[in-house]
Every structure is written in structure tokens, then in C-alpha cells.
């Protein structure tokens, strides 16, 4: 028996959920009330002409991860309002342009993971003027991009192509799309990449390559009139790179002018940093790469790394570098000195210790650095860390959170312009004059602090949540404070007088504390309308801890009897 619409769960707005219900067909009885229909992860094999005929108000149709092998020509003909169509991971071996001819409002189309070899004989997308996100191809059979495949498309926010086994690319195929914000290309073997790349120079803003094996990649010189002025970003995700192919990848960047961001995520470098100097010499300085991001780089032969001097000349213009979770324990002094334009350096989740950081932050290192992030490294001594960083004359922001400092010495040296310091999750249990007096923002949340009695005359923001404080800090220590986040401590109460003493306070977050709901406290918190403007997490996070008969109640809602208040 066919499945009924009653096998779906629909809300009053017409959003119907039929995911993972072992449905073998589209339920019957669907009406114009349905606005969104999710039938993904079922066993549907066939979409018939009449299955969706009455769904004239349907905006989103999700049929991904089924067993669909046939879609009748006019199955979607009544879906004149459809904006989102997902047919991914089915068994469609032939695609038909007639499916889409009535879908002029379609913005999102996902055809990934179906076993077609090509996109068909006629242009599939020529009736989709509003299409903004398109996902096509698969990881095994999709073999050819044809010249007419993208006809009719002028602007795409995102184009994803599963081209792991692409064998043929007709030149200029992608050139028909005038503007592509983001192209995601799954391409195991990059032999066709240069051809494709050339066609994107005038239209693409952001190229993301996934799962590419660059081991034998050779970027043959291509003839172009002028470099791309629109391309802004490259991402290499899960790529395999060798020393030789790294040089070839860098050549890609020669064809781009203007500021550029380059990102390597989850890549493997099967090399020893032995980058060919002669080949690198042919590359113009990477004067246009301003942002370099490397996350989870795997270097099997890390300890065999050669001298990186061959790439120093390419780094002079880089302003922002992130190298995260890549087992970095040392940045060579000579490299630091070559990073003459660097303003922002994020080395989160690495292996930096103070002593090797000293080598990195040597004299004349990173002369313009203003932000340094060393979150979750191997720093142990706050005193040594500050001392080592004194060479960084322009450093204003320092994040050394998630390092195990435990204690704080009485005094420390710091760069003289320090304004922001993040010491959250560092196991510290007391504060001392080690903290720089110049600070404007201090984050010491998630530690073991039970008091705050330190004068910081310029501090504007204090984040001290998840500690063991019993009271609000004394306002006289913090005359400029405008933001105080002190939630999840052990504060019992605070008063109007305390709040008024913070003359510049605009935001207080103090929820999640153990409030004693005394008559005075309730009278103050419930009687001050303006308090809601200051308390950013009011009323939901303010619960009574005592008296016991009101424990767990919201402070805002708690009422004590007259007898309790006039004993």
C-alpha cells in the first residue's frame, strides 16, 4: 500500500519531516499546505508525475540519500515556488533538463553523488535564472564537462563539482558563468586543473580544491592575457603535497593580482621542506598573499625538515598567518625576521614552549605584530612567557588561554602596549601585579580564582565567568569597567549600591550564581526596570539557590511572603 501523508510529521507552518522512515515512495495525499518536504534517507526509487502535483506552494524539497533511479519528465512542473531541490546521492544515471523547466524560482540544486557520466545532451540549467547554489558530479563515474553544460547560468554563489575522476574538460565550459563566488572542486588527479583554472580567472572569487593528490602535479604554463583581479581566496582541503608539487601549487598564485587569502586544511606534506630554489626563483614574490591559514597539517617526516630559507623571500607581504594544530614547536628566528608585514599570528593547538618561543620571538622578529594567539600550547610559566615576548614592541593582543600556568608570579615583564590578554582556562588560582597595567580587556574565565582585588585602571572589559568568586569585584579597582561577565561563580547577592559604584558599567552578565533570594535582593532586582538593560542574561539565568522552598525558581518570578520579609 502507498504511504499516506499521515506518515509525515508536519508543523502548522507546513514544514513536513519524513526523514529516515523507510518510505519506498513519496507519500500520497500531499496538499498545497506543504511548504517544505524532507524525505531524505529513505528507500524511494521513483518520482511520478502526480506525486507532487498538488504541492503548488512547496519551497523546499529534499530527496537526498534515497534510491531514486527515475524522475518523470513533469514531476516538478507544478512546483512554481520551489527554491531548494536536493536530489543528491540517488541512482540517477541520466539527467533531464525538462525536470527543471518550470523551476524559475529555484535557488539551490544538489545533484551530487548520482551515477551519471555527463550532465546530458542539452543544457540542464538554462531555465534556472535564479539559481545561486549548484552541486553536481560524483566521486566515480562523472567523466566529462561539456561546453554547453553551464549555459544560462550567469551568477552562482556556490558551485560544487565532484570531479574526482574527470577525464575531459571542454575549454571555456566554465567561462559561460560570468561570476562564481565560491567553486568547490573535488579533484583527485589535478591534470585538468590548469585548463579549468584559466577559465575561471575572470569570474571566480574563491577556489576550493578538495581531496587532490598533487604528488605528480605539474602546472604547465598557460597563456593568459592578464592575471585575475577577482580571485581572492584559495583553499586546499585534504590535499597531498610533495616538496616539488608545492612549488607548482605556488605557481598558481602568479596568475592572481590583488590581496589573496590561501588556506591549507587537513593536508599532508610528504616532503622535507626541500623546496626547489631554482623553481621558486621563477615565481614572483607572493606579494599578493596577505593571509595564510594552515590547519591540521600532517608532515610525516617533520623532524627531517630542511632549511626553509628557500621560501623566506615569498613571505614578506603576509599580514595574517594561522598555523593551527600542526605540531609546530619552533618558528625559526630567521623566518620570524623575514615576516616584516605580519600583524596577526595564530599558533593555536601547537607545541610551543617558552624556551623555543624565545627563538621565534627573537630580536627584530615580527616587527609589526599586534595579535599573537598561543592558545593550547605547552607554555608553563607566565613570567617567562611575558619576558620572551618583550621584543614584540607593537603587540597589543595576546591569547595564551588553555596553557597550564597554575600560578602567577608577583611581577612580570610584558610588551609595553598590551591591551588585551586572554588567560582563560589556565588553572590560575590567584591574581597578582604580574598583569600589565595597560590592559583594557582581560579574560580570566574558567580558572580557580576566589577573589579579585587588583587595580587595573584602564580595564574596560573583564571576563571572569566560571571561577569561585563570592562577590562582585570592588569597583574602585576598575574605574573604567564597562563590561563584566561574572556568570557561574559562587556569588550569593549583589546590591544597587554595588552596581552604581561601577560608573561606566553598561553590561553585566552574572547569571548561573548561587543567589540567596532575600527580600532585599528580590526587591532590588524586580523593582529596577533599567536593570534588564544592564543584565545581558536576565532573567533566564538568574535562579534562586535559597531559601530552599524557592530553589531553582527564576529570581524574576520568585515571591516571598510578607511574614518572611517582616520578621
Amino acid at each position: 500500500a502507498p504511504h499516506q501523508a499521515s506518515s509525515l510529521s508536519c508543523d502548522p507552518a507546513g514544514v513536513c519531516d519524513g526523514r529516515s522512515r523507510s518510505l519506498s515512495s513519496i507519500p500520497s495525499g500531499l496538499t498545497a499546505a506543504v511548504k517544505s518536504l524532507d524525505l531524505s534517507n529513505n528507500r524511494i526509487a521513483y518520482v511520478g508525475s502526480s506525486d507532487l502535483r498538488k504541492c503548488v506552494n512547496l519551497r523546499a524539497l529534499r530527496l537526498g540519500a534515497n534510491s531514486i533511479h527515475t524522475v518523470e519528465e513533469d514531476s516538478f512542473s507544478s512546483l512554481g515556488s520551489l527554491e531548494h531541490l536536493d536530489l543528491s546521492y540517488n541512482h540517477l544515471s541520466n539527467l533531464s533538463s525538462s525536470w527543471f523547466k518550470s523551476l524559475s524560482t529555484l535557488k539551490f540544486l544538489n545533484l551530487l553523488g548520482n551515477p551519471y557520466k555527463t550532465l546530458g545532451e542539452t543544457p540542464l540549467f538554462s531555465h534556472l535564472p535564479n539559481l545561486r547554489i549548484l552541486k553536481i558530479g560524483n566521486n566515480d563515474t562523472f567523466a566529462e564537462i561539456q561546453a554547453k553544460d553551464f549555459q544560462g547560468l550567469t551568477f552562482l554563489q556556490e558551485l560544487e563539482i565532484g570531479a574526482s575522476h574527470l577525464q575531459r574538460y571542454a575549454p571555456k565550459s566554465l567561462r559561460s558563468i560570468q561570476n562564481i563566488s565560491h567553486l568547490i572542486l573535488h579533484m583527485r588527479r589535478p591534470a585538468l586543473l590548469p585548463k579549468i583554472f584559466v577559465d575561471l580567472l575572470s569570474s571566480l572569487e574563491y577556489l576550493e580544491l578538495r581531496n587532490t593528490d598533487f604528488s605528480t602535479f605539474n602546472f604547465s604554463d598557460v597563456s593568459i592575457n592578464e592575471p585575475s583581479t577577482v580571485m581572492k581566496k584559495f583553499t586546499f582541503r585534504k590535499a597531498e603535497i610533495t616538496d616539488a608539487s608545492f612549488t607548482e601549487i605556488v605557481k598558481l598564485l602568479n596568475y592572481v593580482s590583488g590581496a589573496l587569502e590561501v588556506e591549507f586544511d587537513d593536508c599532508t606534506l610528504n616532503g622535507r621542506g626541500d623546496f626547489s630554489t631554482s623553481a621558486l626563483d621563477t615565481i614572483k614574490s607572493l606579494g599578493n598573499v596577505e593571509t595564510l591559514t594552515v590547519r591540521r597539517l600532517h608532515i610525516p617526516q617533520f623532524f627531517l625538515f630542511y632549511d626553509l630559507r628557500s621560501i623566506y623571500s615569498l613571505t614578506g607581504a603576509v599580514k595574517r598567518i594561522t598555523i593551527e594544530n600542526s605540531k609546530v614547536f619552533l618558528v625559526p628566528c630567521s623566518l620570524s625576521q623575514h615576516l616584516k608585514s605580519l600583524e596577526y599570528l595564530d599558533l593555536s593547538e601547537n607545541l610551543m614552549s617558552e624556551e623555543y618561543l624565545k627563538n621565534s620571538a627573537c630580536e627584530h622578529a615580527w616587527p609589526f605584530l599586534h595579535t599573537l594567539i598561543l592558545r593550547q600550547n605547552h607554555l608553563k610559566s607566565l613570567e617567562k612567557t611575558g619576558e620572551v615576548l618583550v621584543t614584540l614592541k607593537n603587540l597589543t593582543n595576546l591569547d595564551i588561554s588553555k596553557n597550564n600556568f597554575d600560578s602567577m608570579p608577583e611581577t612580570c615583564q610584558w610588551p609595553e602596549k598590551m591591551k588585551y590578554l586572554n588567560l582563560s582556562s589556565t588553572r590560575i588560582h590567584s591574581l597578582t601585579h604580574c598583569l600589565p597595567q595597560t590592559l583594557e580587556v582581560l579574560d580570566i574565565s574558567n580558572n580557580n580564582l576566589n577573589s579579585f582585588s587588583l587595580s587595573l585602571p584602564q580595564l574596560k572589559e573583564l571576563y571572569i565567568s566560571r571561577n569561585k568568586l563570592k562577590t562582585l569585584p570592588d569597583a574602585s579597582f576598575l574605574p573604567m569597567l564597562s563590561v563584566l561577565r561574572i556568570s557561574r561563580n559562587t556569588i550569593n547577592t549583589f546590591s544597587k549600591e554595588q552596581l552604581d559604584s561601577f560608573q561606566k558599567l553598561k553590561t553585566l552578565e552574572a547569571g548561573g550564581n548561587n543567589f540567596i533570594c532575600s527580600c532585599d535582593f528580590l526587591s532590588f532586582t524586580q523593582g529596577q526596570q533599567a536593570l534588564a538593560q544592564v543584565l545581558s542574561d536576565w532573567p533566564e539565568n538568574y535562579l534562586c539557590d535559597s531559601p530552599s522552598h524557592v530553589r531553582g525558581q527564576r529570581v524574576q518570578d520568585t515571591r516571598l511572603s510578607l511574614t518572611e520579609c517582616h520578621r
Partner: antibody, heavy 118, light 111 residues
Amino acid sequence: QVQLVQSGSELKKPGASVKLSCKASGFTFTTYGINWVRQAPGQGLEWIGWIYPRDGSTNFNENFKDRATITVDTSASTAYMELSSLRSEDTAVYFCARLTGGTFLDYWGQGTTVTVSS
Amino acid sequence: DIVLTQSPATLSLSPGERATLSCRASESVEYYGTSLMQWYQQKPGQPPKLLIFGASNVESGVPDRFSGSGSGTDFTLKISRVEAEDVGMYFCQQSRKLPWTFGGGTKVEIK
């Protein structure tokens, strides 16, 4: 405070396998590497290999590559080292040690004595 | 593999004397200006204890009579005034190349 507590002594027959444990406390387990080093009676120290609990990546001394397996249970903050096809030359004290700064072993377990004898 | 040769095999000193322990590597352990050489102390029945890392950095909690020096292939551990509690084996270790290797050790004893 940082502590590495190792499992108790083992007596094994040649050809058998042994699995040693090393329970860590006092630091964020996934942030540091764990190394295994052994010391035969009256001898020097021999590095076996390491694991980084954050991503499970390992590196081994070639002499042990075919016989040693290093694993972690991050939920229990525990590292394990299994050595198979034991021979009498594997009789030694086996230490686990925390790897800091990518290069040095700053905290060591108390050691587990493994005796291989028929 | 990098071979580390320690000398002397045994060092016998009176309390208050200066101890000089040597470690020579078969190839350089230099890594971008930092020598990846460590020194450990091991007392009988105990695990090794880190004294020096990166050739010259003294581990926190280690008495300041211990110091390390050297670069490239030649390294020295000095104990300025030996005390009775300093007896034991001293091992050098390189982490420049895999496999990491240890020296054969120098035994320090008090006369």
C-alpha cells in the same frame, strides 16, 4: 600536579603479547604527546615511539615498528603500548613519558617491569 | 640513526667538586638555531628526570648548580658543586631526527 601512573609488572612467555597502560592526570591529555621508552636491566634507554592523543598520530623506532602498537583512550586519559611476539631480549622496564615542546620528556611514569621467560 | 657517545663512563668526585659530563653526537642536532639535545638524571629504581632541554634550558625545579651548553655535535652538562644527592646515571638524548636516541650514560658517584 602532573602524574603518569603505569600498570603493574608482567611475566610473559616468549611469543606472547603484553599490553601496558599509562594513566595521565593533572594536565590536558590531548594537548601533549605520550612517549614510550624502555630500559633493559643494567642498560641504557631505548625510545620505542610516541602518540599524539589529539589526532592519534604515531611514530615508531624502526626496531619496534612491526611489533609495537601505541593507542590512547582519551575519555580515560590513558595511553597503551602493546608489544607482540615477545622474546627474552624484551625483558626490561617500560616507561611512558609526557612529550612537551615537541622534543623533551618532562614527566615520566614509574615504569612497568616486563619479564619474558619460558 | 644519530649515535650519542657519552664520556666519561664513570665520574667519581668529592662533594663540592665540579662535574663535567660530555655528550658527542654523530651528526649535528641543530634545528634552526636550537640544539635539540636533552639531559636526564636517573637514580636507582626511579624513572629518568629531565634536567636540561634544548641544550641549555634548565627545567623548572632543577637546582641552579646544573647547567648545559654546546651546539652542533658537542654538548656538556656541568654540575658546579656536586652534592651527595646528585649520584646516579646521566643520559643525553637527541630529538633532531627519528628515531630519538639516548647516550649510553655517565655514572656519577661520590668518593
